[in-house]
């Protein structure tokens, strides 16, 4: 799915009002120094692509995130604010149902959610000019950004 045409401000609002708090709840009891963010994103559509992948795709050692509260709210936000997103997710929903057997919080899942928090931070506040084309429509060329 191409996230370019999503309403980023509405998704950001949904994240800050509820999803962020659910992620914090999931991570509660985990030391803030425990995980190093290794997944990054370069613009808002890219951030949403990475967020979708980490939230809904089962990975080795963490198969169960898709049924967590933050994941369901993420799915709802994307369905509402990304045109045509719901239609692309029918097959993914079937895969999710198959993964619904056990709800276990593993260290790998905690690490994955830590990565998600980092991706959401960059979605909320893109840093560089190359992130601007779809994010900052009206004054992007007034920004002077430096990339090292």
């Amino acid at each position: 799915y191409d996230f370019t045409n999503c309403d980023f401000e509405k998704i950001k609002a949904a994240y800050l009002s509820t999803i962020s708090k659910d992620l914090i709840t999931y991570m509660s009891g985990t030391k803030s120094t425990e995980f190093n963010n290794t997944v990054s994103c370069s613009n808002r559509p890219h951030c949403l692509t990475e967020i979708q992948s980490l939230t809904f795709n089962p990975t080795a050692g963490c198969a169960s995130l898709a049924k967590e509260m933050f994941a369901m709210k993420t799915k709802a936000a994307l369905a509402i604010w990304c045109p045509g997103y719901s239609e692309t997710q029918i097959n993914a929903t079937q895969a999710m149902k198959k993964a619904r057997k056990s709800k276990v919080t593993t260290n790998k899942c905690l690490e994955q959610v830590s990565q998600l928090q980092g991706l959401w931070r960059r979605f909320n506040r893109p840093l560089l000019k190359q992130q601007g084309s779809s994010d900052y429509k009206d004054d992007d060329d007034k920004h002077h950004h430096h990339h090292h």
Epitope: S32, N36, S40, G118, W120, N124
Partner: antibody
Framework: EVQLVQSGAEVKKPGSSVKVSCKAS????????IEWVRQAPGQGLEWMGV????????NYNENFKGRVTITADKSTSTAYMELSSLRSEDTAVYYC????????????WGQGTTVTVSS | DIVMTQSPDSLAVSLGERATINCKAS??????VTWYQQKPGQSPKLLIY???NHYTGVPDRFSGSGSGTDFTLTISSLQAEDVAVYYC?????????FGQGTKLEIK
């Protein structure tokens, strides 16, 4: 508990440079943006720039006309702000701050470093 | 640059009374507004992020509202420890900019 500890006060001559350090502890340094903000005596807050220590991407306030350079050393969890071509108007308290968990605010601040520019 | 203009510059309110500080942006900043409190000789402290969200440990008497260009910080019942300078900040566009500050005192 996250802590940002800054280097000590500096007195500098006009035209010289100053480099202020900001050492982070209690969190994963490379996961959060580090901001630099200054405050002239009796004045408000002025944002200078930001660095992502994870990939050293930066963004500067162009009002400083290229005089600001922000760097980070992951091995020591330390960010640096260097300001060149100093003038008397640069006399201020310089703060480093860390972005919060949502990326929408600065939740931890250093204690501030006083830089005095005087001939 | 987006200019953030606070009003009033200073405000004197009686203990237990309501204090209201306004912040106006020169162009829309959506909901990307943060409020900070700074006491004399101290670093700023985060109070409210994304217009109305309380930072951890901030008392309920502080609240934020607004969207677009007009924002308000309200202290419902002023306490002695609330004497400080309050700043709004936008993070919608680079460079990030702050209001000039509002000094809150006890009447």
């Amino acid at each position: 508990e996250v802590q940002l500890v800054q280097s000590g006060a500096e007195v500098k001559k006009p035209g010289s440079s100053v480099k202020v350090s900001c050492k982070a502890s209690g969190g994963t340094f490379s996961n959060y943006l580090i901001e630099w903000v200054r405050q002239a005596p009796g004045q408000g807050l002025e944002w200078m720039g930001v660095i992502d220590p994870g990939n050293v991407d930066t963004n500067y306030n162009e009002n400083f006309k290229g005089r600001v350079t922000i760097t980070a050393d992951k091995s020591t969890s330390t960010a640096y702000m260097e300001l060149s071509s100093l003038r008397s108007e640069d006399t201020a308290v310089y703060y480093c701050a860390r972005e919060d968990n949502t990326g929408t605010a600065f939740d931890y601040w250093g204690q501030g470093t006083t830089v005095t520019v005087s001939s | 640059d987006i200019v953030m203009t606070q009003s009033p510059d200073s405000l004197a309110v009686s203990l237990g009374e309501r204090a209201t500080i306004n912040c106006k942006a020169s162009q829309s900043v959506s909901s990307d507004v943060t409020w900070y409190q700074q006491k004399p000789g101290q670093s700023p402290k985060l109070l409210i992020y994304y217009v109305s969200n309380h930072y951890t440990g901030v008392p309920d008497r502080f609240s934020g509202s607004g969207s677009g260009t007009d924002f308000t910080l309200t202290i419902s019942s002023l306490q002695a420890e609330d004497v400080a300078v309050y700043y709004c900040q936008q993070h919608h566009r680079f460079p990030l900019t702050f209001g000039q500050g509002t000094k809150l005192e006890i009447k």
